[in-house]
Interface confidence: medium
């Protein structure tokens, strides 16, 4: 049994880091493998993660961590029974993938403005809480070419757009994702999408 693709890990910079790797053949990850992780810190204890299958030869492990700080560094060992298959390290602050925003809501009752709001996925005491910026994706269910991205570079988790920038009388969907420039993170996963019917009053023509 050998590791084909070494583990790569990303952290949500809160409580979970996710490591993925590939073996050289079909593997029952949960029965055959264990991923050991230990914070390089005074008197820290090692922890065991039981991986799950992620495709035939792929494995994924969700490492539970206490509140992460930028200096944290973990040793990682991948074991198959008594055999050490791979040894490495992981610094969560250098491999951050933020949590996806939640509770995306489209408010259509604000005159002819669409107000999209969502929730910051971090609690106020987490460093990322005040460092997230967002991308909002809006698309038409009827017209694949009607697909747009709005970058929200301010901290408030909301976006206002004129309803008239979208076509009237058809259904749209929206979703949002986050990233943090401070840690040069990757983008989060997209939030679940939300759907609404876009309708607005055409302005009277002026003669």
């Amino acid at each position: 049994m050998k590791v084909l693709q070494e583990p790569t890990c990303v952290s949500d910079y809160m409580s979970i880091s996710t490591c993925e790797w590939k073996m050289n053949g079909p593997t029952n990850c949960s029965t055959e493998l264990r991923l050991l992780y230990q914070l390089v810190f005074l008197l820290s204890e090692a922890h065991t993660c039981i991986p799950e299958n992620n495709g035939g030869a792929g494995c994924v492990c969700h490492l539970l961590m206490d509140d992460v700080v930028s200096a944290d560094n973990y040793t990682l060992d991948l074991w198959a029974g008594q055999q050490l298959l791979w040894k490495g390290s992981f610094k969560p602050s250098e491999h951050v993938k933020p949590r996806a925003p939640g509770n995306l809501t489209v408010h259509t009752n604000v005159s002819d403005t669409l107000l999209l709001t969502w929730s910051n996925p971090y609690p106020p005491d987490n460093y990322l809480y005040n460092h997230l910026t967002y991308a909002v994706n809006i698309w038409s269910e009827n017209d694949p070419a009607d697909f747009r991205i709005y970058n929200v570079t301010y901290l408030e988790p909301s976006l206002r757009i004129a309803a008239s920038t979208l076509k009237s009388g058809i259904s749209y969907r929206a979703r949002v994702r986050a990233w943090a420039q401070c840690y040069n993170t990757t983008w989060s996963e997209w939030s679940p999408s939300t759907k609404w019917h876009n309708s607005y009053r055409e302005p009277f023509e002026q003669h």
Epitope: L36, Q38, V40, F41, L42, L43, S44, E45, A46, T48, D77, W79, L84
Partner: antibody, heavy 117, light 107 residues
Amino acid sequence: EVMLVESGGGLVKPGGSLKLSCAASGFTFSSYAMSWVRQTPEKRLEWVAIISGGGDSTYYPDSVKGRFTISRDNAKNTLYLQMSSLRSEDTALYFCARLHYWYFDFWGTGTTVTVSS
Amino acid sequence: DIQMTQSSSSFSVSLGDRVTITCKASEDLYNRLAWYQQKPGNAPRLLISGATSLETGVPSRFSGSGSGRDYTLIITSLQTEDVATYYCQQYWRNPYTFGGGTKLEIK
């Protein structure tokens, strides 16, 4: 060269107190956790106190908790162990040791503590 | 607490011998194990960490092996200066604990 030199050992009666010191040199003292490890007359090793580099965190095994206090003076590069309510089973050779997270990478030569009436 | 058992408290060896010192833990350590050498009248010295990683300055005749609960310190060709007591220490669970030691004596 890393050097750790203990002092302060001696003969003390049960229930008595003693304060050990350890002078450190050859490394950036404040960057390392430090510890006291004792060796019993039967030659068994047991750590009895650990302190973080900044001195803000301390750790003790149940056998000495509430009786021993570890401290450090980073300005003087010195580690201390205040021992009180001493018992005969505390009789040992006490080593000052530098801690590399989980194991002890440098040790002093030790100072002897004898608890006897 | 994790119990660390060094089955031989002492044994006699000859110079040039291949010496194997064993250490057994009461639970799986996943290689979180260190070995120390203590010469008579001296402080312990760290030889090996992570069950197999030799510390800087330690002669290459020393090596560590093992996994799970069973670990071994090997001296391939015993020298006079290797006469000492050897201790294992686990750092899998706090409180970290030491084995009782194995003393090498020359026949």
